[in-house]
Interface confidence: low
């Protein structure tokens, strides 16, 4: 169903797990706890997730709604260029760096700003919705 | 490093309004929501509602919904709470606090030293 | 509204003792838990966020934790400063609620 590709399109897919919230076609995990960014990604990978990886300024803007000032790592890096962890590159929208040493992407409810890995932050995983909800 | 201010004690009148402030500083006001707790005497904590001081955009606990009103005044970086038609049941220490975080999952790492509110003749 | 069951609701203990507060929600709250230490003069402060995330600054003595629907504080070795009112808040949904406070004396 849509339990192929972390990144596929989940169109007709139906309800989340728990603790998950859906919005349009995908589920999202807003998280309690802080990590860094390494220990977000496998927190999402661990629950056949991603780190946020944002298609368009349209899913953007639904997210941000749901954000306050504070950021929260997403996946997206600073390898050469700011890419998704998907591999496809940042280019519906900017961000925000004030070092070189800022290598990890975070999202607030103002945009996209650059931080240190390694600052524990809160986080938001992705994925698609499962038919099954009493897999998690 | 982060203050929250407010003033020691308000002696008011029953039936009369009452606006309490909390004054912050070491931090960026408009990024955090402040949210209110009431305490009687000897009693537990409520939590009254919150404010965001970006847009002032409000979540009250419909139990202080005809009580508190929550406004901010963002030039002094200043949040306040008044409560209107004071009877003794109102009679309590008002904390201010802040929030951190999304808004959906809020705690209080920042606390004022609260305002204790007597109601009496 | 989300009830919070908070026992017990006051423990005498001696310095140095380890002790367990429990608050139990009424329905899931998703561990999204908080307590605080309230001071005798009314001062507050986040001890854990998120069930069992310790604040800054807090002491490692503290420590948080959560089986099913309770949710516990334990101190594994009591200080003198630690003798204060304790409070769990859940802030998983609106209104935000508090358990009603643990009262922790010397004995």
């Known amino acids: 169903l849509c339990q192929g590709s972390n990144y596929s399109t989940c169109a007709s897919c139906p309800s989340c797990p728990d603790r998950w919230m859906k919005y349009g076609n995908h589920c999202y995990y807003f998280s309690v706890e802080e990590k860094d960014w390494n220990s977000s990604l496998e927190f999402c990978l661990a629950r056949d997730s991603h780190l946020l990886v944002i298609t368009d300024n349209q899913e953007m803007s639904l997210l941000q709604v749901f954000l306050s000032e504070a950021f929260c790592w997403i996946g997206l890096r600073n390898n050469s260029g700011w890419r998704w962890e998907d591999g496809s590159p940042l280019n519906f929208s900017r961000i925000s760096s004030n070092s070189f040493v800022q290598t990890c992407g975070a999202i607030n409810k103002n945009g996209l700003q650059a931080s240190s890995c390694e600052v524990p932050l809160h986080w938001v995983c992705k994925k698609c919705p499962f038919a099954d909800q009493a897999l998690f | 490093q982060v203050q929250l201010q407010q003033p020691g004690a308000e002696m008011v009148r029953p039936g009369a309004s009452v606006k309490l402030s909390c004054k912050t500083s070491?931090?960026?006001?408009?990024?955090?929501?402040m949210h209110w707790v009431k305490q009687r005497p000897g009693q537990g904590l409520e939590w009254i509602g919150k404010?965001?001081?970006?847009?002032?955009?409000?979540h009250y606990n419909q139990k202080f919904k005809d009580k508190a009103t929550l406004t901010v005044d963002k030039s002094s970086s200043t949040a306040y709470i008044q409560l209107n038609s004071l009877t003794s049941e109102d009679s309590a220490v008002y904390y201010c606090?802040?929030?951190?975080?999304?808004?959906?999952?809020?705690?209080?790492?920042?606390w004022g030293q609260g305002t204790l509110v007597t109601v009496s003749a | 509204d989300i009830q919070m069951t908070q026992s017990p609701s006051s423990l005498s203990a001696s310095l140095g003792e380890r002790i367990s507060l429990t608050c139990r929600a009424s329905?899931?709250?998703?561990?999204?838990l908080n307590w605080f230490q309230q001071k005798p003069d009314g001062t507050i402060k986040l001890l854990i966020y998120?069930?069992?995330s310790l604040d800054s600054g807090v002491p490692k003595r503290f420590s948080g934790s959560r089986s099913g629907s309770d949710y516990s504080l334990t101190i594994s070795s009591l200080e003198s400063e630690d003798f204060a009112d304790y409070y769990c808040?859940?802030?998983?949904?609106?209104?935000?609620?508090f358990g009603a406070g643990t009262k922790l004396e010397l004995k």
């Open positions: 070491g931090y960026t006001f408009t990024s955090y929501w």
């Open positions: 998120g069930t069992s």
């Open positions: 404010i965001d001081p970006s847009d002032s955009e409000t």
């Open positions: 329905q899931d709250i998703y561990g999204s």
């Open positions: 606090a802040r929030g951190r975080l999304l808004r959906l999952r809020d705690w209080f790492p920042y």
């Open positions: 808040l859940q802030y998983a949904s609106f209104p935000l609620t």
